[in-house]
Amino acid sequence: LEVQVPEDPVVALVGTDATLRCSFSPEPGFSLAQLNLIWQLTDTKQLVHSFTEGRDQGSAYANRTALFLDLLAQGNASLRLQRVRVADEGSFTCFVSIRDFGSAAVSLQVAAPYSKPSMTLEPNKDLRPGDTVTITCSSYRGYPEAEVFWQDGQGAPLTGNVTTSQMANEQGLFDVHSVLRVVLGANGTYSCLVRNPVLQQDAHGSITITPQRSPTGAVEVQVPEDPVVALVGTDATLRCSFSPEPGFSLAQLNLIWQLTDTKQLVHSFTEGRDQGSAYANRTALFLDLLAQGNASLRLQRVRVADEGSFTCFVSIRDFGSAAVSLQVAAPYSKPSMTLEPNKDLRPGDTVTITCSSYRGYPEAEVFWQDGQGAPLTGNVTTSQMANEQGLFDVHSVLRVVLGANGTYSCLVRNPVLQQDAHGSVTITGQPMTFPPE
C-alpha cells in the first residue's frame, strides 16, 4: 500500500495548529471498516492517534490531535495537531493498513519568531571616543536557536568581541542575549540582527552612540592626503599627528587606530598606556614621540589584505579623526617569453608569443611593441590570476603573423609603482628556430 507524505518538514509556529499530511489511494469498494490508521512518534513508537475497526479511537497525545474523519474515505489520513509546542518537534509516522499496509514518516519543524531586540548600553553616560562600551542585544521567546550578527550603520559586519548566550525557558523557547564589547570611535550606529534560521525571519535592533563633545572644540588631526604606498613584505608608516597643548600628559590621551570601513580595532593607546596591537600583532606606535603629538602607526610585513583606509582617532579633552589610505604594491618580475611554434618558422606563419610576469600587485597594464617601440596591434589576450597572498601572475599572449624578421617586446607596467618590466624576443632569418641554436 502506497502512503504519501510531504518530503519537506512541516513548519508550524508555536501555539498554532499544524496539519501533518498523509494520504493513501483507496481501492473501489473500500469501506472505513477495513481501515486501520495509526499515527505514532517515529523514534519512541509512542501512540499519537488511531482509527481502527471503523472508529476514531481518539487522541493518545494530550488530547491535541484530530483526524479529518469526513475525508478519510477518500484516502486523507492527515493528522491535525493543535496548539503546537516545542516538544512536538520531530518525526511522526503514518501507518495505513487495509488488506496490505504501508507507512511513511513526516517531520514537524516547530518555530517561533524572535521579538524585536532591545538594546542596552553600558556605560551609557559621559562617553568619549576611546572608551570601551558593552552593548547588549536581547531578543525573546524564539525557536529554534537564533543566529546573531552585529553590523555598523552601513551594514558592514562588526568584528569586535562578541559573546552570545541562548537560554531555553520552560516551554523550550529561547531568550538570546548577545554582548558586543567595542571601543568607541567618534560616533556610530551599532546594529544587532537576530535571525530565525527556520523562518528566515530577521529581527533588528540598533543603537546610535554620539560621544560627548568638549565646548573648547575638536582636536585637529593631520594625516597625509595621498595614499601611503607600501611594498608587500616591507614595513609602512601611516602618519598621523595632533598638536598637544602645554601641560599635555599621555594619561589624558586616547588614541585609536581602526579600519575605516569595518571599524575593526587595529591599535590603541588609552589610559596612559599602549594597549597593543589588535591586528595580528603587526602594528606599533612611536611611543617615544607620542607626547610630541606623533600618533603615527607602524604596520609591519605589509600584506595585500592590508590595503584600504585606516582611521586615526585622537581624543584628549575632545576628539578629532582623520583617515589615511594604504596602497599596497609589489613589483612584477622580469617577463619570461615563450614562442609557439618555435621551430621551422617562415614569414607568413602565425605564432603565439607568451609573456609571463609574476607576483605583482596591483593588476598590471600590459603593452606589446615592435623593435621600434611602436604598439603591436595583433591579437592580444591577457589574463591575471591572484595567488593565495593576493599577488597577481600575468600572462599575455600575442598572436601575430611573422614578417621577414622582427623583435616583439612585452612591457608589464605596475600602475602604482610606475615600474615597467620588459621582455622581448627577436625572430630572424628563414627557416628559423626558437630559441636560436
Epitope: 556605560p123 553616560k125 568619549r128 570601551t132 558593552t134 573648547t216 594619561a251 596612559g272 579633552r317
Partner: antibody, heavy 116, light 107 residues
Amino acid sequence: QVQLQQPGAELVRPGASVKLSCKASGYTFTAYWMNWVKQRPDQGLEWIGRIDPYDSETRYNQNFRDKARLTVDKSSSTAYMQLSSLTSEDSAVFYCARGVRIFDYWGQGTTLTVSS
Amino acid sequence: DIQMTQSPASLAASVGETVTITCRTSENIDYTLAWYQQKPGKSPQLLIYNANTLEDGVPSRFSGSGSGTLFSLKINNMQPEDTATYFCKQAYDVPRTFGGGTKLEIK
C-alpha cells in the same frame, strides 16, 4: 537595580592583611571599571585605584601602589581589594564605586579598624 | 597629580537660601568635573558630571557651571535634606583626585 554590597566592618591587627569585597548586581559586571576610594574620619576622599573586570587591567594611585592589590572574580561578580602591612593609618572607610570618569554607584563602605 | 581646592570648608545656610560652593583645579581640566553629595553615615552620591550635567533623579535646584580651572556648584532654595558634605572630583587625569569637601549645614 544596581547594587554594590560591601561588608560593614573589618577588625584586623597591625601588620596583617585584609581582603575587602564588593559584590555587584543589577548590571553587566564586566562593562564598568570598579574603583576603590578611601575616606578617613572627617577627612576627604582618596582614590586608590581601579580595575577593569573584563580583563583585570588595573590602574593605581602611586600612593597606594605598595599597599593595595585589586582583583575580581567574574563568576561571582565580585571585586576585591587586598590591603597589606596594615597600620593605624589604614583605619578608614573603604568604598567601591563603579565607573570610568563618573562614579555613579557606590557601595555602602567597609569600616576597617586596625588595632591590637 | 591635579590638586583640587574647594571652598568654603564649611557653611551654614537657611532654608530657601541660595548656596554656592567653588572648586579650583591646579591645571586646566576642561569640563571633566563631577560633584558628589555625602550625607552623614552614607556613601557619596553623584550629583553632577561634565561640570553641568545633572545626574538622573537629582533635584533641579542643583546646578553646576565652569570649565578650565574654576567650577561652582549652586543650590537654589536650600532644603533641610541638602545638609551634607559636597565634594568635587576631576576626571581629566589619573589618579582621580577629590576636593577637600564643603560641609553644608542648616542655619
